[in-house]
């Protein structure tokens, strides 16, 4: 049967029917329902929400909806022994203590079970010592401190501002610098946009607001005790000493009122330049230690959190495909939140809920997608992408054979300025074509397409008349699907104007103030941006699941591969003498990219011409498209990061949130001038060029005519 026969409705009508069924009012209602109490991973509140979602997805019409549970390592504060930081005098008396909780927002004063701010997976400890201010605690910040300013962090407690990079990278950098504790704080320069009031009167962070978050360096491992395998009932668990990615020094987050008290006394070196100054009325001295009058005072951390193996619950819904039930298109987003989750994750979960409802409505009218659609409500994303990773580990054999695409659905908004998309190059054309068909929700773009407003507000740096689409990094649930399994992936959300708002993320991220009211009052009162994101995410899923030929364009991969090869070559060419000395050549990589380009071009020609009524040939061509992303996977993984297996993309080793291209070569070249054994270092560069060239060539050959 053709897909039109199987589904009884013409493809054009299907997509329109699906999109027309999506309603802003429903998303609003779902968001309200999901945000009235906290849904912290491993709590009864979050389990109840899982059961509610399971029940509602069944009502919406999915074929089956199951809970998948895993027993993973989570981290919680000690309920009777709170975490805090103090300034102590020479007698050891605590003369200042940081706050134990955030003042609750209006209307939430009586809510129980709000987890106090903490850094998940911090070890216990009560270190005391002098403070060193390390800016954002990025790799380059520690280079500046250690190499230029000759400041030694060994045995010190460092204080770092949130922003720019994933907090886990900050902690890793501090550990490597020898610090014995880390204090993370939100500086108004990064979390308070000028001209906007703080919550509840605006969307800015109040002084008592604190960002929670995990500080792991998992590198894609999932549950720290069961890397590579699902944390099921018969799992063999590592001892805590062998667990993956746990920090070794105590870490704690604070707000800017408390940070002011610590930073105002800082002495020692002045900040190296203005980029080290935030917006507090403090000198931003680097230290170590406090200034003159306060030089005998020290900082002491009191951290009593515990790591516990805890049961988590994913919700997995299935809408069986009519023609290719063994091909899976997955829409997934997490359900667990740090507190109320007004934006993260429930603005995404509410959109998924409405997408499921719309698909269910079509199914009840007799329609089915061509391919199977799986819907997922992931648990424990905030604790290291655990729910999605454990499920993918458990189902890896199915996914690597049947996975067509994964669309992520965390926060639908981080602003209300324009669209933001990160995806595999295979999806560029899908995203372009879809957004040309959708209406822009933006003021001043009435009657214009989403593509037009997006392109105007966020133009591509390379191609005029096209919007910016970014590389996938990590820090969200697509990680295991894309970076480990090589399943084509994408994500979309509404974002801020990065040019005018230079704060990191959105100000109230992971704080108690991330409420329904934050969204309804300040970000999206009409829920029109949420609706647009639902249309983009849902539209992508619809096309991926229903188009006869998969909507992937392999030529776009060819274009970016050339761009990435040029970029990594120019990085390497900063060392022309060494390249000559060690005979480093990129010829093999450029040759492979050229071959890929030519083969992709020929494949695309065949794709236009083949007989689509022949189900065997159709399946063959679609399989070549589906397996192209898989072909970029190196089964051995990247050096010291076995679960990051994609050769073209990986999360940056210096910032988990950012994507890096040709990461193996990039990491081999990074700071190569400081390596003690240059011959060995350049040998590794050559090896990584070899791996990259081979992988690109091998991927190209999967697109060649099969015989």
């Amino acid at each position: 049967k053709s897909s039109n026969e199987a589904t009884n409705i013409t493809p054009k009508h299907n997509m329109k029917a699906f999109l027309d069924e999506l309603k802003a009012e429903n998303i609003k209602k779902f968001l309200y329902n999901f945000t009235q109490i906290p849904h912290l991973a491993g709590t009864e509140q979050n389990f109840q929400l899982a059961k509610q979602i399971q029940s509602q997805w069944k009502e919406f019409g999915l074929d089956s909806v199951e809970l998948a549970h895993y027993d993973v390592l989570l981290s919680y504060p000690n309920k009777t022994h709170p975490n805090y930081i103090s300034i102590i005098n020479e007698d050891g008396n605590e003369i200042f203590n940081t706050s134990l909780f955030e003042p609750p927002p209006p209307g939430y004063e009586n809510v129980s079970d709000i987890v106090p701010p903490f850094s998940a997976f911090s070890p216990q400890g009560m270190p005391e010592g002098d403070l060193v201010y390390v800016n954002y605690a990025r790799t380059e910040d520690f280079f500046k401190l250690e190499r230029d300013m000759k400041i030694n962090c060994s045995g010190k407690i460092v204080i770092a501002r949130y922003g720019k990079v994933f907090r886990g990278n900050k902690v890793k950098n501090a550990q490597l610098a020898g610090a014995k504790g880390v204090i993370l704080y939100s500086d108004p320069a990064d979390y308070f946009a000028p001209g906007v009031k703080s919550y509840p009167d605006g969307w800015n962070l109040p002084g008592g607001g604190v960002q929670r978050g995990n500080i792991l360096n998992l590198n894609g491992a999932g549950d720290p005790l069961t890397p590579g395998y699902p944390a099921n009932e018969y799992a063999y668990r590592r001892g805590i000493a062998e667990a993956v990615g746990l920090p070794s020094i105590p870490v704690h987050p604070i707000g800017y009122y408390d940070a002011q008290k610590l930073l105002e006394k800082m002495g020692g070196s002045a900040p190296p330049d203005s980029s080290w100054r935030g917006s507090l009325k403090v000198p931003y001295n680097v230290g170590p230690g406090f200034t003159g009058n306060f030089s005998t005072q020290k900082v002491k951390m009191h951290i009593h959190s515990t790591n516990e193996v805890t049961r988590i619950y994913n919700v997995i819904g299935t809408l069986r495909g009519a023609v290719e039930p063994d091909r899976y298109v997955i829409l997934g987003g997490h359900r667990d939140s740090w507190v109320f989750g007004g934006i993260d994750p429930q603005s995404g979960a509410a959109v998924v809920h409405e997408i499921v409802r719309s698909f269910g409505t079509l199914k009840k009218e007799g329609w089915r997608p061509r391919r199977t659609i799986l819907f997922a409500s992931w648990d424990a994303e905030e604790f290291g992408l655990l729910g999605s990773t454990e499920w993918a580990e458990e189902n890896s054999r199915l996914l690597q054979e049947r996975g067509v695409a994964y669309i992520n659905a965390d926060s639908s908004i981080e602003g209300n300025y324009t669209l933001r998309v990160d995806c595999t190059p295979l999806m560029y054309s899908l995203v372009h074509n879809l957004t040309k068909e959708l209406k822009s929700p933006d003021e001043g773009f009435e009657g214009k397409s989403l593509y037009e407003s997006w392109t105007k507000k966020s133009p591509s740096p390379e191609f005029s008349g096209m919007p910016r689409i970014s590389k996938l990094g990590s820090g969200n649930d697509f990680e295991v699907f894309f970076q480990r399994l090589g399943i084509a992936s994408g994500r979309a959300r509404y974002t801020k104007n990065w040019e005018t708002n230079k704060f990191s993320g959105y100000p109230l991220y992971h704080s108690v103030y991330e409420t329904y009211e934050l969204v309804e009052k300040f970000y999206d009162p009409m829920f029109k941006y949420h609706l647009t994101v639902a249309q983009v995410r849902g539209g992508m899923v619809f096309e991926l699941a229903n188009s006869i030929v998969l909507p992937f364009d392999c030529r776009d991969y060819a274009v970016v591969l050339r761009k990435y090869a040029d970029k990594i070559y120019s990085i390497s060419m900063k060392h022309p003498q060494e390249m000559k000395t060690y005979s480093v050549s990129f010829d093999s990589l450029f040759s492979a990219v050229k071959n890929f380009t030519e083969i992709a071009s020929k494949f695309s020609e065949r794709l236009q011409d083949f007989d689509k009524s022949n189900p065997i040939v159709l399946r063959m061509m679609n399989d070549q498209l589906m397996f192209l992303e898989r072909a970029f996977i190196d089964p051995l993984g990247l050096p010291d990061r076995p679960f990051y297996r994609h050769v073209i993309y990986a999360p940056s080793s210096h910032n988990k949130y950012a994507g890096e291209s040709f990461p193996g070569i990039y990491d081999a070249l990074f700071d190569i001038e400081s390596k003690v054994d240059p011959s060995k270092a350049w040998g590794e560069v050559k090896r990584q060029i070899y791996v990259a060239a081979f992988t690109v060539q091998a991927a190209a050959e999967t697109l060649s005519e099969v015989a």
Epitope: I37, P38, L40, G42, T43, E44, Q45, N46, F47, H69, D71, L74, Y76, K79, T80, N110, V111, S112, D113, V115, E233, E308, V309, T310, R311
Partner: antibody
Framework: EVQLVQSGAEVKKPGASVKVSCKAS????????ISWVRQAPGQGLEWMGE????????YYNEKFRGRVTLTADKSTSTAYMELRSLRSDDTAVYYC??????????????WGQGTTVTVSS | DIQMTQSPSSLSASVGDRVTITCRAS??????LNWLQQKPGKAIKRLIY???SLDSGVPSRFSGSRSGTDYTLTISSLQPEDFATYYC?????????FGGGTKVEIK
């Protein structure tokens, strides 16, 4: 549906021990713990302790520590409460109740029918 | 230990009456309070959890509320099957403690 079925009534002499069982069905045993509560004749309810079979963790009311032992058998989805050195004021109805195994929970949702323990010489 | 003081210890009411039972906590317990119903020869039943959330299958005439450390169970229109003993339970901190109970009898 969720059911907690307790063992039958017991008559014990002072100084003896009693072991009450609570067989669970209708849910995943290891996703929940079992709390034990007692009620002396004409009196209110008193929490004795709880056990979480998945982790094997037990938590006791200090009043009963050293005299009560909570155990669980995952293979049969059964929890046990043993009370030693019985006294006449241990005469009571002993209840088991289900509690979610998680950092935050809503305490006891489903209760057993109760087991009467009479301590008399 | 947290003390839960429940009042009244007993009350007589007629079918259709509005009934309120109160528990006072000796210290802050947030919303960590449940209301239980006990009938002779039957398993204890949880009616309300987290101060005000109704358990599934519990009639909407039952409701819970809070004012500071005072917690109230309200039965808006007493029905014949509601004659029973009611207990509050705090689970904010161990050991968990119960109120002394309120016996609701037919007037």
């Amino acid at each position: 549906e969720v059911q907690l079925v307790q063992s039958g009534a017991e008559v014990k002499k002072p100084g003896a021990s009693v072991k009450v069982s609570c067989k669970a069905s209708g849910y995943t045993f290891t996703s929940y713990g079992i709390s034990w509560v007692r009620q002396a004749p004409g009196q209110g309810l008193e929490w004795m302790g709880e056990i979480f079979p998945r982790r094997g963790n037990t938590y006791y009311n200090e009043k009963f520590r050293g005299r009560v032992t909570l155990t669980a058998d995952k293979s049969t989805s059964t929890a046990y409460m043993e009370l030693r050195s019985l006294r006449s004021d241990d005469t009571a109805v002993y209840y088991c109740a289900r509690v979610f195994d998680g950092y935050y929970n809503y305490a006891m949702d489903y209760w057993g029918q109760g087991t009467t323990v009479t301590v008399s010489s | 230990d947290i003390q839960m003081t429940q009042s009244p210890s007993s009350l007589s009411a007629s079918v259709g009456d509005r009934v309120t039972i109160t528990c006072r906590a000796s210290q802050d317990i947030g919303s960590s309070l449940n209301w239980l119903q006990q009938k002779p020869g039957k398993a204890i039943k949880r009616l309300i959890y987290a101060t005000s959330s109704l358990d599934s299958g519990v009639p909407s005439r039952f409701s819970g509320s809070r004012s500071g450390t005072d917690y109230t169970l309200t039965i808006s229109s007493l029905q014949p099957e509601d004659f029973a003993t009611y207990y509050c339970l705090q689970y904010a901190s161990s050991p968990y403690t119960f109120g002394g109970g309120t016996k609701v009898e037919i007037k």
